[in-house]
């Protein structure tokens, strides 16, 4: 089966000032919950859009 | 080499819970997850759920929320799946099966045949 | 969930023939990494499940070259060129692209 949480990434080229780490998938670190029917494309593109937000609010020199 | 050695045969009533056992060896526990399979001859295989024994982090079938709860203990290499409120529903054979990225060699458990009967 | 249908349900064969699994998905298996993750896997009688085939068509180590893997998008086929009478048992494609993972009905292959 393939990994959900230890999966290999392809990294998101960003500015070298930020670091992003966030998975891609169904992730929950308690053992009580999880799951959801989200595609991967899906989630993969709500990722990008988050990080592109987060991009945005960085205050860039004059 | 590799091995993932489930725990035997279980016969349980109606309504109460079982916990499963899956022991890897032959590799380091925590750089692998661990996923579980349910096998019946009416629904054939499916996906329960995933654990990564790192961290504790879990995933789970939609399905089997409520019903399955994965752990792992990292001292022994040995995860762990509590099935409750068993009804005959849950009479299955269920297999552990070594996480990968998609490619990398795939390992199952010989398989743990689970009866719920009064 | 993705639907994962695979034909034909039993397939009986004479040893030395060939043979020919489909398997359709309800949505394209093509990931946003640009892989597709359909595997297969054999089933032997009173056996775990050993997966033969991942990526669509590369063969796991060991698997005999008579059986290749193709298709892409939606549509999968497993094919063995010379069926020999080792490869009885039921034959199951996968998909873990889309959570959460699924898997088709299942094939049985008997030998004529």
């Known amino acids: 089966m393939r990994n959900i949480f230890k999966r290999n990434q392809e990294p998101i080229v960003a500015p070298a000032t930020t670091t992003a780490t966030m998975p891609i998938g169904p992730v929950d670190n308690s053992t009580e919950s999880g799951g959801a029917g989200e595609s991967q494309e899906d989630m993969f593109a709500k990722l990008k859009e988050k990080l592109f937000n987060e991009i945005n609010k960085i205050p860039l020199p004059p | 080499q590799v091995q993932l050695q489930q725990s035997g045969a279980e016969l349980v009533r109606p309504g109460a819970s079982v916990k499963l056992s899956c022991k890897a060896s032959g590799y380091t526990f925590t750089d692998y997850e661990m996923h579980w399979v349910k096998q019946t001859p009416v629904h054939g295989l499916e996906w329960i759920g995933a654990?990564?024994?790192?961290?504790?982090?879990?995933a789970y079938n939609q399905k089997f929320k409520g019903k399955a709860t994965l752990t792992a203990d990292k001292s022994s290499s040995t995860a762990y799946m509590e099935l409750r409120s068993l009804t005959s529903e849950d009479s299955a054979v269920y297999y552990c099966?070594?996480?990968?990225?998609?490619?990398?060699?795939?390992?199952w458990g010989q398989g743990t045949s689970l009866t719920v009967s009064s | 969930d993705i639907v994962m249908t695979q034909s034909p349900l039993t397939l009986s064969v004479t040893i030395g023939q060939p043979a020919s699994i489909s398997c359709k998905s309800s949505?394209?298996?093509?990931?946003?990494?640009?892989?597709?993750?359909l595997n297969w896997l054999l089933q032997r009688p009173g056996q775990s499940p050993k997966r033969l085939i991942y990526l669509v068509s590369k063969l796991d180590s060991g698997v005999p070259d008579r059986f290749t893997g193709s298709g892409s998008g939606t549509d999968f086929t497993l094919k063995i060129s010379r069926v020999e009478a080792e490869d009885l048992g039921v034959y199951y494609c996968w998909q873990d692209t889309h959570f959460p993972y699924t898997f088709g009905g299942g094939t049985k292959l008997e030998i004529k």
């Open positions: 949505q394209s298996l093509l990931d946003s990494d640009g892989k597709t993750y």
């Open positions: 654990i990564d024994p790192e961290t504790g982090g879990t």
């Open positions: 099966t070594r996480g990968n990225d998609g490619y990398n060699e795939d390992y």
